[in-house]
Structures are given as structure tokens and as C-alpha cells.
């Protein structure tokens, strides 16, 4: 049975130009975590595996930073980075948890975080 | 429990026009990304795109840009795909799938469409 | 586009049988790749996802393995209900793309 609940950085905004990190936080279960796969919307981001380490897709390499941790770090920004961001959690013996970040990058700079959530 | 409901055989003439449903139940329609698949006769299956019901965003295959165009209608949580100009080489079961992330959990049972005169 | 080649078109195998099918990527697809079973009249069915994570429900006698461009899927002891054809696909960037399948039947 899943128990575990992923809590994440929720609805998040940052000035274009700037980098923005990416957290997700898995609790509530002592599942192992096995990888965890970064996408926005259906295209993949990157992979970090636990024997294999990370995998950053090519065509973000330039942009995007591992960590820290199991999160994920955008630098650049653009307004085209504006959208949904997704971490999945793959896990033993549980299987997959999956948690969603909204990123609106802005034009002004007063771009300011918005509060945590939880996914269940 | 999760469930995609395809709508049923055509049979069209060539040149016309054909618009497939997706009807979904057990989740909420707005979730996840609908992708819809081909397979011709006797053959593999090839990936046409998707539709994200949230705000309607699609991406295409290459290939059938111009062939399909995706639609999604929220308040029946059904997704549509229309194909157009057909041929006989449009002859084929056409599958939709949701993308729980990363991988198609759960399919449409398929429809069947013959292009004929 | 990534091509995904699956060597085998058929494979012969007999009840208790080890079978493994193998699936080459054309490029460096880490771990993002899925295997489905579909048997005739049917839609496909999800067996494995992320190259070696068992999905939901799916019997333990289905394994994959690999990463980066070589992988593989694995039936360890053959029932008679696993008679059907089965997908590579990789999820790593669209347009996301099938293998032709291999179609495994009775020996």
C-alpha cells in the first residue's frame, strides 16, 4: 500500500534571467528511492538513478543543474520555462509517487515563492 | 477504476473526414495527457501525439501534422481525435492512452477505421 | 527521431521456458524505456516501465534490464497466456517511438 505523501515547492515564480531550484521531498513511507525522473509536461528533464546516477536530456544540458539533492536546478530562465514541472518518485516496494511544481517566470522583479503543498 | 472509451468502427469514404472519441471515467480528466497511437494491418505502433485536457496544449508527431488534430472537451472529460483527407493508408486501429507519468498506464479498447469506396 | 529496434520479429518458446527480447536505441535513452504486451483483438498492456520497474499487478516472472541504448525483457518460466507480441517503446523525448515488436509463440 502507498503511503507516502510528496511534498513539493508548489506554485513558484522567478525573474527570467534568473535559475530557480526545483524540490520535491518524499515522506510518510520508508520506501526506498530508487530514481527520481524530472519532466515538464511529457518532455523528460532529467534522471537521477541511484546506481546510475544523473542524466540530463541533451537538449537542456546548457540549463539545467543536478541537484541539490534529488532536486533539480533551472538557470536561464526564460518565459517559455513557464508551466508544469513534474517529479516522480520511483520506489521500492511502493512504486511511483509523483508531485507537481507550477513555475511562472516574470518579466518585473518581483518574483517571490509561493507557499509548500502537499501531493498525496 | 481507470477507463478510456473509444468509439465504435467507421467506415469512411476516401477524402472524408472522420473524428474519433475518447471518453474517460475514473480520474480526473484534466490530470494527465491523452496520447493517441496508430497501428496499421498487421503492424507496430506508431505514436500521432497529445492533448493536455488542463489547458488544451497539444504536440504532434511530425508525421501527422496536417492528418490529425487533437481536441479535448472538459465537461464530458472526452478526447477527440479528427483525421482528415483520408486514404487507405489512414486504414488502421487508432488507440488512445493516458500518460500517468512516465509510461501509458491504461488504454482505449481501439477503434477500427476502414478507408473505402 | 529515436528508433528503437527490436531484432527479433518471432521468437519460438515452449510452457517453462526462459525467453528474453532484446531492444536497441538509436541514441543514449538512459533508462526511459517501457515494455507492453498485446495480444490479438486487445489493446497493448503495460508490463515494465524506467527499463526495469515492474508495473502495478504485473506477475514477477516479467523483468527488464539495461540502460543507455541496450535493453532487455524477460520472461523467466513461459505460461501459456504470455503467447503475444511485445513493445519496446522509449518515453525519453517525442516523438516518443515504438520497436516493431517481437511476436512470441509456441514452439
Known amino acids: 500500500m502507498m503511503t507516502g505523501t510528496i511534498e513539493t515547492t508548489g506554485n513558484i515564480s522567478a525573474e527570467k534571467g534568473g535559475s530557480i531550484i526545483l524540490q520535491c521531498h518524499l515522506s510518510s513511507t520508508t520506501a526506498q528511492v530508487t530514481q527520481v525522473n524530472w519532466e515538464q509536461q511529457d518532455q523528460l528533464l532529467a534522471i537521477c538513478n541511484a546506481d546510475l546516477g544523473w542524466h540530463i536530456s541533451p537538449s537542456f544540458k546548457d540549463r539545467v543543474a543536478p541537484g541539490p539533492g534529488l532536486g533539480l536546478t533551472l538557470q536561464s530562465l526564460t518565459v517559455n520555462d513557464t508551466g508544469e514541472y513534474f517529479c516522480i518518485y520511483h520506489t521500492y516496494p511502493d512504486g511511483t509517487y509523483t508531485g507537481r511544481i507550477f513555475l511562472e517566470v516574470l518579466e518585473s522583479s518581483v518574483a517571490e515563492h509561493g507557499a509548500r503543498f502537499q501531493i498525496p | 477504476q481507470v477507463q478510456l472509451q473509444q468509439s465504435d468502427a467507421e467506415l469512411v469514404k476516401p477524402g472524408a473526414s472522420v473524428k474519433i472519441s475518447c471518453k474517460v471515467s475514473?480520474?480526473?480528466?484534466?490530470?494527465?495527457?491523452i496520447h493517441w497511437m496508430i497501428q496499421r494491418p498487421e503492424q507496430g505502433l506508431e505514436w500521432i501525439g497529445y492533448?493536455?485536457?488542463?489547458?488544451?496544449?497539444?504536440k504532434y508527431n511530425e508525421k501527422f501534422k496536417g492528418k490529425a488534430t487533437l481536441t479535448a472537451d472538459k465537461s464530458s472529460s472526452t478526447a477527440y481525435m479528427q483525421l482528415n483527407s483520408l486514404t487507405s493508408e489512414d486504414s488502421a486501429v487508432y488507440f488512445c492512452?493516458?500518460?500517468?507519468?512516465?509510461?501509458?498506464?491504461?488504454w482505449g479498447q481501439g477503434t477500427t477505421l476502414t478507408v473505402s469506396s | 527521431d529515436i528508433v528503437m529496434t527490436q531484432s527479433h520479429k518471432f521468437m519460438s518458446t515452449s510452457v517453462g521456458d526462459r525467453v528474453s527480447i532484446t531492444c536497441k536505441a538509436s541514441?543514449?535513452?538512459?533508462?526511459?524505456v517501457a515494455w507492453y504486451q498485446q495480444k490479438p483483438g486487445q489493446s497493448p498492456k503495460l508490463l515494465i516501465y524506467?527499463?526495469?520497474y515492474r508495473f502495478t499487478g504485473v506477475p514477477d516472472r516479467f523483468t527488464g534490464s539495461g540502460s543507455g541504448t541496450d535493453f532487455t525483457f524477460t520472461i523467466s518460466s513461459v505460461q501459456a497466456e504470455d503467447l503475444a507480441v511485445y513493445y519496446c517503446?522509449?518515453?525519453?523525448?517525442?516523438?516518443?517511438?515504438f520497436g516493431a515488436g517481437t511476436k512470441l509463440e509456441l514452439r
Open positions: 524506467s527499463a526495469s
Open positions: 517503446q522509449q518515453h525519453y523525448s517525442t516523438p516518443l517511438t
Open positions: 492512452a493516458r500518460r500517468a507519468l512516465p509510461y501509458f498506464d491504461c
Open positions: 475514473g480520474y480526473t480528466f484534466t490530470d494527465h495527457t
Open positions: 541514441q543514449d535513452v538512459f533508462t526511459a
Open positions: 492533448i493536455y485536457p488542463r489547458d488544451g496544449s497539444t
